[in-house]
């Protein structure tokens, strides 16, 4: 039961995370105009990975796409690439993890196959989350660098009375969405990897069957084991107990002094 819960939760957390990464990638507010120096501006600028926008106080918003590819900063291209890679890996991970879910039965798929798929999706989620976090962090670093550069020469062309105030940009909402989403995807991936350990068949060096002698009056049924073909494929023994309130996931997998007959 614990494995199923861990796997399910990992899937849901990753799903939310990937949705967040997609949302962050599409959002226009990666960088927003810093209003510290000019809190009374009637024009508000903000920029995304794909377009820049201007919102006038009167309510009109105008957005213009970056229609050039070669003219864009390399860092912006890198951030775009990281976010897209994150989304693609996350999407594939979600697809794989759907089939790996313990609660979904697909033909006669063995637990070992599900375990492998769970691990694969988990690794994909981890890499996806890392890509998103890296992308957002690179963009944030770019903003910080530009912010202090523009602060250094805040007023350009101080010819006489005329002042030209440079527009400075600070962190936009998309950065925080991206960080949180990347973190969630990463956590979801870790949970999937943990669930994989619980799903994976235990390889033992003996063919003898074992049972737990618990404090309860447990009747041992020799016919209660599934036939096993050895150590390789499906060696996870499933026990049937008369008082069976436990599910297969709750069976302790650590050997105790009572384990061996």
């Amino acid at each position: 039961m614990a494995v199923t819960a861990c796997q399910g939760l990992g899937f849901v957390v990753s799903l939310i995370g990937i949705a967040g990464i997609i949302a962050a990638t599409c959002m226009d507010q990666w960088s927003t105009q810093d209003l510290y120096n000019n809190p009374v501006t009637a024009v508000f600028n903000y920029q995304g990975l794909w377009r820049s926008c201007v919102r006038e106080s009167s309510g009109f918003t105008e957005c213009r796409g970056y229609f050039t590819l070669l003219g864009l900063p390399a860092m912006l291209q890198a951030v775009r690439a990281l976010m897209i890679v994150g989304i693609v890996l996350g999407a594939i991970g979600l697809l794989v993890s759907i089939f790996a879910l313990k609660c979904i039965r697909i033909g006669s798929m063995e637990d070992s196959a599900k375990a492998n798929m769970t691990l694969t999706s988990g690794i994909m989620f981890i890499v996806s989350g890392l890509c998103a976090i890296a992308g957002v962090s690179v963009f944030a670093n770019m903003l910080v660098t530009n912010f202090w550069m523009s602060t250094a020469n805040m007023y350009t062309g101080m010819g006489g009375m005329v002042q030209t105030v440079q527009t400075r940009y600070t962190f936009g909402a998309a950065l925080f969405v991206g960080w949180v989403a990347g973190g969630l995807t990463l956590i979801g991936g870790v949970m999937m990897c943990i669930a994989c350990r619980g799903l994976a068949p235990e390889e033992t060096n003996y063919k003898a069957v074992s049972y737990h002698a618990s404090g309860h009056s447990v009747a041992y049924k020799p016919g209660g084991f599934k036939a096993s073909t050895g150590f390789g494929s499906n060696t996870k023994n499933k026990k049937i107990y008369d008082g069976g309130a436990r599910t297969e996931d709750e069976v302790q997998s650590y050997p105790s002094k009572h384990d061996y007959v």
């Epitope: 009637a42 024009v43 201007v54 106080s57 009167s58 309510g59 527009t167």
Partner: antibody
Framework: QVQLQESGPGLVKPSETLSLTCTVS????????VSWVRQPPGKGLEWLGV???????NYHSTLISRLTISKDTSKSQVFLKLSSVTAADTAVYYC???????????WGQGTLVTVSS | DIVMTQSPDSLAVSLGERATINCKSS????????????LTWYQQKPGQPPKLLIY???TRESGVPDRFSGSGSGTDFTLTISSLQAEDVAVYYC?????????FGGGTKLEIK
């Protein structure tokens, strides 16, 4: 079509509060901002303040302590209140709709307010 | 506050001639985000409310004759009437629409010579 109409008392005593109403039609106050502008007799235009579609306001720095702009969206009305008036506040008061580029694209006919005892 | 300075205070031009009105702001009105200048020109005839002529420094409002044109960027702007008509006699105002308060220039009175 878009229309704005200012109304209010034409005469206000010094130290009292000047209250004006701008009734609009042809557009929604939730979508567009309305500015107040005044013009003393024989002088130029002076921007007083604005109330935007979202209800936020901006006031002229010299009037911020005396000026309040509010609105009743359901009645399509914008209100201006200017307290502690003096003879210097005598002017034609206009309300105007904010459009593209924050420009005032439609204006009311204006109402003359005289501050005198 | 941004100070808007118009010149000249008054201008007399013959019918059919070009009229040029200047406006200077104490700070740049150019928005880097969209490369637009937030300067507006109004025309006010005697006994009437002002009428919007040009916004974004050079974009003509619909219904405004094409003899009116705006130019300039940053801090220096110009309103040009290419061929003065009798109905163009009015006071012309420029306005900063970039930063609050949205200050007006002092106005330029245009007359026929």
């Amino acid at each position: 079509q878009v229309q704005l109409q200012e109304s209010g008392p034409g005469l206000v005593k010094p130290s009292e509060t000047l209250s004006l109403t701008c009734t609009v039609s042809g557009f929604s106050l939730t979508s567009y901002g309305v500015s107040w502008v005044r013009q003393p007799p024989g002088k130029g235009l002076e921007w007083l303040g604005v109330i935007w579609g979202d209800g936020s306001t901006n006031y002229h720095s010299t009037l911020i302590s005396r000026l309040t702009i509010s609105k009743d969206t359901s009645k399509s009305q914008v209100f201006l209140k200017l307290s502690s008036v003096t003879a210097a506040d005598t002017a034609v008061y206009y309300c105007a709709k904010a459009g593209r580029g924050n420009a005032l694209d439609y204006w009311g006919q204006g109402t003359l307010v005289t501050v005198s005892s | 506050d941004i100070v808007m300075t118009q010149s000249p205070d008054s201008l007399a031009v013959s019918l059919g001639e070009r009229a040029t009105i200047n406006c200077k702001s104490s700070q740049s009105l150019l928005n880097s985000g969209n490369q637009k200048n937030y300067l507006t020109w109004y025309q006010q005839k005697p006994g009437q409310p002002p009428k919007l002529l040009i916004y974004w420094a050079s974009t003509r409002e619909s219904g405004v004759p094409d003899r009116f044109s705006g130019s300039g960027s940053g801090t220096d702007f110009t309103l040009t009437i290419s061929s003065l008509q009798a109905e163009d006699v009015a006071v012309y105002y420029c306005q900063n629409d970039y930063s609050f308060p949205l200050t007006f220039g002092g106005g330029t009175k245009l007359e026929i010579k």
